[in-house]
């Protein structure tokens, strides 16, 4: 029986050109995390494997950094980064848990009066 729950950073609004951290946390289970996949729509962004470490998809290498922890840092944000991101936890013996985070990237003029975030 899958007892775990995924907590996420929550949905985020961010400024074009800025950076944000996407994070998920698996709790309420003793299952072992074997791998975490980060995806957007049907695209694989990155994998963190318990044995092999991080692999960033070649097409995202310039703008995606691993961590902190099992999270993912997205840099040099563009409007086209707006969308839903998935953290997919592969665990044993429970199976797969999925968290969802929506990111809206705003033009600077909009972000000034919106809820915008940028990591220095």
């Amino acid at each position: 029986m899958m007892t775990g729950t995924i907590e996420t950073t929550g949905n985020i609004s961010a400024e074009k050109g800025g950076s944000i951290i996407l994070q998920c946390h698996l709790s309420s289970t003793t299952a072992q995390v074997t791998q975490v996949n980060w995806e957007q729509q049907d695209q694989l962004l990155a994998i963190c494997n318990a044995d092999l470490g991080w692999h960033i998809s070649p097409s995202f290498k310039d703008r995606v950094a691993p961590g902190p922890g099992l999270g993912l840092t997205l840099q040099s944000l563009t409007v086209n980064d707006t969308g839903e991101y998935f953290c997919i936890y592969h665990t044993y013996p429970d199976g797969t848990y999925t968290g969802r985070i929506f990111l809206e990237v705003l033009e600077s003029s909009v972000a000034e009066h919106g809820a915008r975030f940028q990591i220095p």
Epitope: N11, I21, A111
Partner: antibody, heavy 119, light 112 residues
Framework: EVHLQQSGPELVKPGASMKISCKAS????????MNWVKQSHGKNLEWIGL????????SYNQKFKGKATLTVDKSSSTAYMEFLSLTSEDSAVYYC????????????WGQGTSVTVSS | DVVVTQTPLSLPVSFGDQVSISCRSS???????????LSWYLHKPGQSPQLLIY???NRFSGVPDRFSGSGSGTDFTLKISTVKPEDLGMYYC?????????FGGGTKLEIK
């Protein structure tokens, strides 16, 4: 002035599918997320999902995944929601609603489309 | 999914009353950057829902200042300082912090 004009009421048979349209005017269509909301029995509101006109990306409430398909036609500034394999549970009023940038809220709503599923 | 609970279900009022509607969520609506995506809507019979408050306490364009929003974490309140006839209808809160977005069950503001 922002305006969202939805298609007219639908009477459809169980098992059929239908497509509702939402034509946007008064703003730049690709700059704002479009949401879809279901209102059943004149009370409960449920978020069906959203579409990003700029890149076609979608996000669905899992309850409606496989039931609803969201698309846009940028050339006509129109958002569409297709509903598949309709049952009596799908009888409701459906709204499109523009996303308020930066705040995950809905600032302008269409007039609603009433859908009745009946044989 | 985040469960959003509104109270009361029904709120009988007299014009001129001050009223409060409560909205509670099953988990915190503050994201990791400190923003909280909680909004309030009024749905009048025969009309579309209209946005009143976004981001907990920001009044939307054209919304009278008798409407105010407050709260944090899991506990939020909409206040109407002096109820007017045009305020009658169903009030809903919506959380947009977590996927999927979820509405409260609604509060019916009606005349006593």
């Amino acid at each position: 002035e922002v305006h969202l004009q939805q298609s007219g009421p639908e009477l459809v048979k169980p098992g059929a599918s239908m497509k509702i349209s939402c034509k946007a005017s008064g703003y730049s269509f690709t700059d704002y997320i479009m949401n879809w909301v279901k209102q059943s029995h004149g009370k409960n509101l449920e978020w069906i999902g959203l579409i990003i006109p700029y890149n076609g990306g979608t996000s669905y409430n899992q309850k409606f995944k496989g039931k609803a398909t969201l698309t846009v036609d940028k050339s006509s500034s129109t958002a569409y929601m297709e509903f598949l394999s309709l049952t009596s549970e799908d009888s409701a009023v459906y709204y499109c609603a523009r996303g308020l940038r930066g705040y995950y809220a809905m600032d302008y709503w269409g007039q609603g489309t009433s859908v009745t599923v009946s044989s | 999914d985040v469960v959003v609970t509104q109270t009361p279900l029904s709120l009988p009022v007299s014009f001129g009353d001050q009223v409060s509607i409560s909205c509670r969520s099953s988990q915190s609506l503050a994201n990791s950057y400190g923003s909280t995506f909680l909004s309030w809507y009024l749905h009048k019979p025969g009309q579309s829902p209209q946005l009143l408050i976004y981001g907990i306490s920001n009044r939307f364009s054209g919304v009278p200042d008798r409407f105010s929003g407050s709260g944090s974490g899991t506990d939020f309140t909409l206040k109407i300082s002096t109820v007017k006839p045009e305020d009658l209808g169903m009030y809903y809160c919506l959380q947009g912090t977590h996927q999927p977005w979820t509405f409260g069950g609604g509060t019916k503001l009606e005349i006593k």
